[in-house]
Amino acid sequence: MGVEGCTKCIKYLLFVFNFVFWLAGGVILGVALWLRHDPQTTNLLYLELGDKPAPNTFYVGIYILIAVGAVMMFVGFLGCYGAIQESQCLLGTFFTCLVILFACEVAAGIWGFVNKDQIAKDVKQFYDQALQQAVVDDDANNAKAVVKTFHETLDCCGSSTLTALTTSVLKNNACPSGSNIISNLFKEDCHQKIDDLFSGKLYLIGIAAIVVAVIMIFEMILSMVLCCGIRNSSVY
């Protein structure tokens, strides 16, 4: 006999919520795998700038995305399938995973705050590498997509450390409409915007983290309520 009334509502709410979560994880994983295995991006590993081999920040970022996507899919599946199957075991595992993820988020938040300058530096390096790849290999649509995301999200274009060729390519192709890389080269510097994000606008990242944490707590409560509901319904 299945759960009834309010518990049934929680069951479907948890199902829908986690199905969306699972889908989002699938999208992130798919994009990350595309970025990682597309032959155009793979060339970045072998790219040399002058006499120096290119650093690997681009790939570290992609591996983080792959991990996030995989975890989201796994946790989403547990919540989704556990709710629809009314499985106490799966919901218990789901709850445990959420507790672990919550702890990880808190730890990551503390670590991120302490190391925000290094993270900002890595994000800038990630941007530079994506930009470099988009220019050097003009077929690298994935790198272009990363650059476009940076430019549109941060409303910036290029940086004050651009090479001549990158300046020329950006000027003609990759700056958001309305921005002028030549006259606003320093005003719209993406490096500066990244620094601003990790200093002046750190509260935005904080708000995002709190929202995620609240969702996690909300899901933990729902899964526990559903679990108890299943246990109670199986008694009668």
Epitope: D51, D137, D138, S160, T163, L165, S168, N172, N173
Partner: antibody, heavy 119, light 112 residues
């Protein structure tokens, strides 16, 4: 050894057209940006145009915009410059050059081909 | 009239040190884009001599050196040799013109 060999230059009347070619060898042509640079008699060098490895990005000097078209055929390892509506001031030696992203400059040049625009 | 200004000519005797200047503006050399130097020996293709203000490609003797200060750059040739007789060009990128710019070239003569 990197080699760039230009051809197609010659005498042409004002308003006429000419197509320059540059045969490349000794490096992976399809992975490199290529460029044209010219030098008018008694003048300094002047950048004309560039093209990216897969022809996605191109740019031109203001003096030739709308008249010149740069293109490439990676299967033939050849760079082209289609010059239309030629003027007397386009008279120059045209050099084909490889653009190095790492060094951010023209690292290898051809010997050049002379284009004379005169009636 | 070239965007980057170079002396039309320079000369020196074998063994001497010669410096060729290249003056630009805040939109090219002063904007932080590297200054590069090319050598064109009579009847040959231009050859990259110095890149990124002061770096030498492999095969270029260490007698050649480059430097940059503000909106100007210079090429120094020490221990001058007769085979150094050539035209020398400086090059940078100009943000106002949105293109690559060159100096008018300096004809170096090795005397005696």
């Amino acid at each position: 050894e990197v080699q760039l060999l230009e051809s197609g230059g010659g005498l042409v009347q004002p308003g006429g057209s000419l197509r320059l070619s540059c045969a490349a060898s000794g490096f992976t042509f399809s992975s490199n940006y290529m460029s044209w640079v010219r030098q008018a008699p008694g003048k300094g060098l002047e950048w004309v145009s560039y093209i990216s490895s897969s022809s996605t990005y191109t740019d031109y000097a203001d003096s030739v915009k709308g008249r010149f078209t740069i293109s490439r055929d990676n299967s033939k390892n050849t760079l082209y410059l289609q010059m239309n509506s030629l003027r007397a001031e386009d008279t120059a030696v045209y050099y084909c050059a490889r653009y190095s992203y790492g060094r951010d400059n023209f690292d290898y040049w051809g010997q050049g081909t002379l284009v004379t625009v005169s009636s | 009239q070239s965007v980057l200004t170079q002396p039309a000519s320079a000369s020196g005797t074998p063994g001497q040190r010669v410096t060729i200047s290249c003056t630009g503006s805040t939109s090219n050399i002063g904007a932080g884009y590297g200054t590069h130097w090319y050598q064109r020996l009579p009847g040959t293709a231009p050859k990259l001599l110095i890149y990124g203000n002061s770096n030498r490609p492999s095969g270029v003797p260490d007698r050649f050196s480059g430097s940059k200060s503000g909106t100007s750059a210079s090429l120094a040739i020490s221990g001058l040799r007769s085979e150094d007789e050539a035209d020398y060009y400086c090059q940078s990128y100009d943000t106002n013109l949105s293109g690559w710019v060159f100096g008018g070239g300096t004809k170096l003569t090795v005397l005696g």
